[in-house]
């Protein structure tokens, strides 16, 4: 899977959207590596 910063950001945005935004406060692009997905 793509692990550039932009890919990680878009993937996280999709995850946040699907979860209704109910995630940990530190679940942000700069804290989350590609392996989190």
């Amino acid at each position: 899977a793509c692990d550039t910063a932009t890919c990680v950001t878009h993937r996280l945005a999709g995850l946040l959207s699907r979860s209704g935004g109910v995630v940990k406060n530190n679940f942000v692009p700069t804290n989350v590596g590609s392996k989190a997905f």
Epitope: T4, T6, C7, T9, A13, L16, V28, T30
Partner: antibody
């Protein structure tokens, strides 16, 4: 309102260095990567690199490795791009840009900083 | 580096026309492609990410498609404010790279 506000135009001599700033507001600066892109007159956009403002990690376009340095001042929510050993081909508009998720999912760009390299 | 080849480099069109711009990557970039609009003297404005998703606020007349190496930006009915230069970008691999641009001019 998310804003990326860049420093003003610069005129430099060949061989000199330039440091462009990008002040972020309206979102949590350390949550999102900051990209730097440039555009020489009449040319395509060219990616310089990105920085993780939270940890300071960087990725550079090899074309600029060793000449470009990306840094941040977290306390001032400001990103910096320094380019050294300037040559005439570095004359361009330099942009900072960041894809933000909260408060609004969008790819925000600074207004651009014109850097002119001339003897 | 991945090369992004855009075509055409320029086109002339009228208000109401359907406009299609293509972008070809030199290797597989999955759907990790963005499209930008740029007007003279202004910063680029993001339109599309992940090949086919519009950012909020981008008019529905803009649509993107494609995967792998071939991508398309379509403007279904050209409006006066759409005359600009359009760029594709791949962000699947570092360094991110842009196409050479397509200038959409008034016929």
């Amino acid at each position: 309102e998310v804003q990326l506000v860049q420093s003003g135009a610069e005129v430099k001599k060949p061989g000199a260095s330039v440091k462009v700033s990008c002040k972020a507001s309206g979102y949590t600066f350390t949550d999102y990567y900051m990209n730097w892109v440039r555009q020489a007159p009449g040319q395509r956009l060219e990616w310089i690199g990105d920085i993780n403002p939270n940890q300071g990690g960087t990725n550079y376009n090899q074309k600029f490795k060793g000449r470009a340095t990306l840094t941040v001042d977290k306390s001032a929510s400001t990103a910096y791009m320094e380019l050294s050993s300037l040559r005439s081909e570095d004359t361009a508009v330099y942009y900072c840009a960041s894809i933000i998720i909260v408060p609004n999912y969008f790819d925000y760009w600074g207004q651009g900083t014109t850097v002119t390299v001339s003897s | 580096d991945i090369q992004m080849t855009q075509s055409p480099s320029s086109l002339s069109a009228s208000v109401g026309d359907r406009v299609t711009i293509t972008c070809k990557a030199s290797q597989n970039v999955d759907t990790n492609v963005a499209w930008f609009q740029q007007k003279p003297g202004k910063a680029p404005k993001s339109l599309i990410y992940s090949a086919s998703y519009r950012y909020s606020g981008v008019p529905s007349r803009f649509s993107g498609s494609g995967s792998g190496t071939d991508f398309t930006l379509t403007i279904s009915s050209l409006q006066p404010e759409d005359f600009a230069t359009y760029y594709c970008q791949q962000y699947n691999n570092y360094p991110y790279t842009f196409g050479g641009g397509t200038k959409v001019e008034i016929k």
